[in-house]
């Protein structure tokens, strides 16, 4: 009963987590204009992985997609990749875990097969959660770096006469959604792995039973059965470096580090 509960809860937690990862990936507010200690603007800029938006004081919001692939910063591409990998792994994990649920009977599937599938989905959820957390953390690190860079040269211009106010960006809601969702997926994966141990049939040892016949002494010893499952995962962490790239508009190209993050 505890195993079923653990497996079921792991599935639900992972489902919520993956839904959150999808939501975070689609959200536009990965980075938002920093309003603290800044000139008060009549526009509010915010950016996502796929487009940047501007909300004017009238409430009018205009969003523009990043209509380029090669012109985007390498870091942004890396974050996109991590989030997509997380979603794909999570989706496959969900599919596998549905068939692995103890409460669902599919044909004559043995407990050992369900245990294997539970472990597989659990590992997939763990990797999915780690991908999401890594993606969000890489983006957050990029924001922090750019924030201090733009703070250092908040005002730039020719001889101090003409000033250009640089827009500083801070953490958007999507980052927090991503962190929480990644964490939930990770927890769900761990729960699935724990449930797997309970699902695997344990070794059954029966004591030898002696049957005494009138003339002969016969001992019957039934053989023990053992099911074992073992999955190993070896993931290597790779550092991704920003290749510093130019941005592209729908019609014209404007090189600016603020266009995306």
């Amino acid at each position: 009963m505890a195993v079923t509960a653990c497996q079921g809860l792991g599935f639900v937690v992972s489902l919520i987590g993956i839904a959150g990862i999808i939501a975070a990936t689609c959200m536009d507010q990965w980075s938002t204009q920093d309003l603290y200690n800044n000139p008060v603007t009549a526009v509010f800029n915010y950016q996502g992985l796929w487009r940047s938006c501007v909300r004017e004081s009238s409430g009018f919001t205009e969003c523009r997609g990043y209509f380029t692939l090669l012109g985007l910063p390498a870091m942004l591409q890396a974050v996109r990749a991590l989030m997509i990998v997380g979603i794909v792994l999570g989706a496959i994990g969900l599919l596998v875990s549905i068939f692995a649920l103890k409460c669902i009977r599919i044909g004559s599937m043995e407990d050992s097969a369900k245990a294997n599938m539970t472990l597989t989905s659990g590992i997939m959820f763990i990797v999915s959660g780690l991908c999401a957390i890594a993606g969000v953390s890489v983006f957050a690190n990029m924001l922090v770096t750019n924030f201090w860079m733009s703070t250092a040269n908040m005002y730039t211009g020719m001889g101090g006469m003409v000033q250009t106010v640089q827009t500083r960006y801070t953490f958007g809601a999507a980052l927090f959604v991503g962190w929480v969702a990644g964490g939930l997926t990770l927890i769900g994966g761990v729960m699935m792995c724990i449930a797997c141990r309970g699902l695997a049939p344990e070794e059954t040892n029966y004591k030898a039973v002696s049957y005494h016949a009138s003339g002969h002494s016969v001992a019957y010893k039934p053989g023990g059965f053992k099911a074992s499952t073992g999955f190993g995962s070896n993931t290597k962490n790779k550092k991704i470096y920003d290749g510093g790239a130019r941005t592209e508009d729908e019609v014209q190209s404007y090189p600016s580090k603020h266009d995306y993050v």
Epitope: Q33, P39, V40, T41, A42, V43, N45, Q47, S52, C53, V54, E56, S57, S58, G59, F60, E62, R64, V162, Q163, T164, V165, Q166, T167, D249, Q252, Y254, S256, H258, D259
Partner: antibody
């Protein structure tokens, strides 16, 4: 047709108070931010305050903060400007204007204005 | 606060003449988020409220004749009237629409020669 009609103008003594109103019609008032702009006799335009459609945020020109208060009554389609501790330099024509939608924050419709004269 | 400087303060013109009004801002009015300029031009005739002519530095408001052309980016903006008509004689104001407080230029008065 969009219409903005200001009222409440007149002569006020220095240190006195006045409440200006702006009645809006011809558009969904509750969906638009509104501005107050003033113009001293034979002078240029001076932006006074802005109030968003839902009454928050509100922005004022620094020198008038504390003395002037902008508010709105969406069900009555009315914008207000409460002016206190009036000074001679507050003598001007006061216009209410609509913050246009999709016009890069420009003021797309203006009222005819109401005149305030501060003198003893 | 953003300072808007308009030049000239007044201009004497003849009907049919091409006129260029200048407006400079103390800070860039180009929003990097969408690469749009937040500057508006208004026309004010004697005894009337201002009327919006141009927004976003170059977009004409509906109903505004196409002889009014807005241009410029960042800190330098111009309003060009390709062929001045008698009804164009008025004061023209530029306005910063990016930073609060929203500030206006002192205006350029267009007079008949």
């Amino acid at each position: 047709d969009v219409q903005l009609v200001e009222s409440g103008g007149g002569s006020v003594q220095p240190g006195g108070s006045r409440r200006l109103s702006c009645a809006a019609s011809g558009f969904t008032f509750s969906s638009f931010g509104m501005h107050w702009v003033r113009q001293a006799p034979e002078k240029g335009l001076e932006w006074v305050a802005y109030i968003s459609s839902g009454s928050s945020p509100i922005y004022y020109v620094d020198k008038l903060k504390g003395r002037f208060t902008v508010s709105r009554d969406n069900p009555k389609n009315t914008l207000f400007l409460q002016m206190t501790s009036l000074r001679s330099e507050d003598t001007a024509m006061y216009y209410c204007a609509r913050a246009g939608y999709a016009v890069r924050n420009a003021l797309d419709y203006w009222g005819q204005g109401t005149s305030i004269t501060v003198s003893s | 606060d953003i300072v808007m400087t308009q030049s000239p303060s007044s201009l004497s013109v003849s009907v049919g003449e091409k006129v260029t009004l200048s407006c400079k801002s103390s800070q860039s009015l180009l929003n990097l988020g969408n690469q749009k300029n937040y500057l508006a031009w208004y026309q004010q005739k004697t005894g009337q409220p201002p009327k919006l002519l141009i927004y976003g530095a170059s977009t004409r408001e509906s109903g505004v004749p196409d002889r009014f052309i807005g241009s410029g980016s960042g800190t330098d903006f111009t309003l060009t009237i390709s062929s001045v008509q008698a009804e164009d004689l008025a004061v023209y104001f530029c306005q910063n629409d990016l930073f609060y407080p929203l500030t206006f230029g002192a205006g350029t008065k267009l007079e008949l020669k």
